[in-house]
């Protein structure tokens, strides 16, 4: 017997659906109506036929009471080919729900998203995460999606993007966005970062994550941030192959004084990079290739320094920097 496509945990909290049949029984998902966190994986199916069954132009207000009764707070939709019109229809209906976090992964969005009707209500998300989502509309996808959201988005994560650069002139500002995660876009690079960080569109960013994004030097990142007017408190550059030296012809970059936490772990560094901020609260240099203890003049003024997992560090060795935090145990790097 084939397993049930949807499983609801015994506390009505998590519901997971895996629709792998060519002709799935979508009604099985109704058992998820009481769940708080819902994951729907569509097995790579093309959802185009759905458009024939639903009236994408119907007034979503007729579903308002039904949708308000849903407990869902976090929704993940994955592995499908979705017509943009269907996505928009879902967003319009979900605007009446309690949904706060939406994750889209392994999706191919076909067609263009229609503009938001004047009477429509945007979706009040606090978090939007996209992983391996391709859009037929190319660089304008963020601007098109943004119009269907209320302006209170706090967390935006875009991984494995087919087009990580945005059409900046079309994008409106994200006034409440405090966390931007562009990690796992290895082709982004410092030029791509400049294109993705639309100037003055991200005024409230506190946390910027750029893990595995093809960054080359901290100084190059500093320049991209300065050009965009982005002043994060926390910057994650881990899992990039960083060069410690700076191109002598490159202009010196002044880091924002707002930056107090910098993660340079797993960056293949053989020495402390030049051009770091003068003062930091937290600096993570763990799991690099430092063959000797950094000298005080190589390091910023830092309260909390992590050097675990570097070759020079034998467990139990005296710490090289005042106020540093080191477990003395070499982590699995």
């Amino acid at each position: 017997t084939t397993p049930e496509p949807c499983e609801l945990d015994d506390e009505d909290f998590r519901c997971v659906c895996n629709f792998s049949e060519p002709q799935p029984d979508w009604s099985e998902a109704f058992q998820c109506v009481s769940a708080v966190e819902v994951e729907i994986h569509a097995g790579g199916l093309n959802l185009e036929p759905f458009l024939k069954r639903v009236d994408a132009d119907a007034d979503p207000r007729q579903y308002a009471d039904t949708v308000k009764a849903l407990r869902v707070r976090r929704l993940t939709v994955g592995a499908a080919q979705v017509p943009a019109q269907l996505l928009v229809g879902a967003l319009r209906v979900l605007a009446y729900s309690r949904l706060k976090e939406l994750t889209l992964e392994d999706l191919k969005i076909t067609g263009t998203m229609p503009p938001l009707p004047l009477e429509a209500t945007g979706l009040a998300l606090s978090s939007l995460r996209l992983r391996n989502v391709s859009w037929a509309t190319g660089r304008s996808w963020l601007a098109e999606l943004q119009q269907w959201l209320k302006p209170g988005l706090k967390v935006l994560s875009i991984a494995q993007a087919h087009s990580p650069a945005f059409s900046c002139e079309q994008v409106r500002a994200f006034p409440a966005l405090t966390s931007l995660d562009l990690s796992d876009n290895p082709g982004l690079g410092e030029r791509g970062l400049m294109a993705a960080l639309c100037p003055h569109k991200f005024p409230a960013i506190q946390n910027l994550a750029l893990r595995n994004t093809g960054m080359e030097t901290p100084t190059g990142v500093c320049a991209a941030l300065a050009a965009a007017g982005v002043q994060p408190h926390s910057l994650d550059l881990s899992h990039n192959s960083l060069r410690a030296t700076v191109n002598p012809s490159a202009p010196r970059c002044m880091w924002s004084s707002a930056l107090n936490s910098l993660n340079l772990s797993f960056a293949g560094l053989e020495q402390v990079p030049k051009g770091l901020p003068a003062k930091l609260r937290v600096l993570d240099l763990s799991c690099n290739r430092l063959n000797r203890a950094p000298q005080p003049d190589e390091l910023p003024e830092v309260d909390n320094l992590t050097l675990d997992g570097n070759p020079f560090l034998v467990p139990g060795t005296a710490l090289p920097h005042e106020g540093s935090m080191n477990s003395g145990v070499v982590p699995a790097c």
Epitope: E11, D12, F13, R14, V33, S34, E37, R71, R73, S127
Partner: antibody, heavy 115, light 111 residues
Framework: QVQLQESGPGLVKPSETLSLTCTVS?????????WNWIRQPPGKGLEWIGY???????SYNPSLKSRVTISRDTSKNQFSLKLSSVTAADTAVYYC????????WGQGTLVTVSS | EIVLTQSPATLSLSPGERATLSCRAS??????????LHWYQQKPGQAPRLLIY???NLQSGIPARFSGSGSRTDFTLTISSLEPEDVAVYYC?????????FGQGTKLEIK
């Protein structure tokens, strides 16, 4: 059988940050469910503070949201509460609890806010 | 937020009597077929203990003299025949919508 155990200082000074950790045994906090903090001031009723879910998603009581952070350490199967800028009104027994129908409770730890 | 109001504040009964505790919600705590209203018992110095979940389901290990009923906004916890060990404070709680809220409690005393 899932077991939860709170730990942390029993005395915190006003304006400082209260920090508690809940260690979970017999169940992985990344499997499913919500992992909550609930408190009870002496002689009073129960108040939900917030949760971190199996996915890492958080939800907080709006009355405390500006002061609360709930985080987790999946390698230790622990989740933690930080409550900043505490006052005497934050003196309470703090419980860590699994689920949204609260079937599994820690034994609770009394935190007193006093100078 | 959903406000839960419990009544009476105190209930004083004799062993063997039937206890009826009420919980009223400021708005519906139903989501489709389920009522997300739960009942707890708390004895002095102990953590609360789940008695009834989703309005009418008896939590495992709880004696059958405890039962729950109701839907939408009106709920009742019934103890069919009071035992001396039932002296405690009883709380209702809703998990239909965050913030998840508790009633103020009903104190059950034995005469």
């Amino acid at each position: 059988q899932v077991q939860l155990q709170e730990s942390g200082p029993g005395l915190v000074k006003p304006s400082e940050t209260l920090s508690l950790t809940c260690t979970v045994s017999g169940y992985s906090i990344t499997s499913d469910s919500a992992w909550n903090w609930i408190r009870q001031p002496p002689g009073k009723g129960l108040e939900w503070i917030g949760y971190i879910s199996y996915s890492g998603s958080t939800s907080y009581n709006p009355s405390l949201k500006s002061r609360v952070t709930i985080s987790r350490d999946t390698s230790k199967n622990q989740f933690s509460l930080k409550l900043s800028s505490v006052t005497a009104a934050d003196t309470a027994v703090y419980y860590c609890v699994r689920g949204l129908r609260f079937a599994y409770w820690g034994q609770g730890t009394l935190v007193t806010v006093s100078s | 937020e959903i406000v839960l109001t419990q009544s009476p504040a105190t209930l004083s009964l004799s062993p063997g009597e039937r206890a009826t505790l009420s919980c009223r919600a400021s708005e519906s705590v139903d989501s489709y077929v389920n009522s997300f209203l739960h009942w707890y018992q708390q004895k002095p110095g102990q953590a609360p203990r789940l008695l009834i979940y989703r309005a009418s389901n008896l939590q495992s290990g709880i004696p059958a003299r405890f039962s729950g009923s109701g839907s939408r906004t009106d709920f009742t916890l019934t103890i069919s025949s009071l035992e001396p060990e039932d002296v405690a404070v009883y709380y209702c709680q809703q998990s239909n919508e965050d913030p998840y809220t508790f009633g103020q409690g009903t104190k059950l005393e034995i005469k």
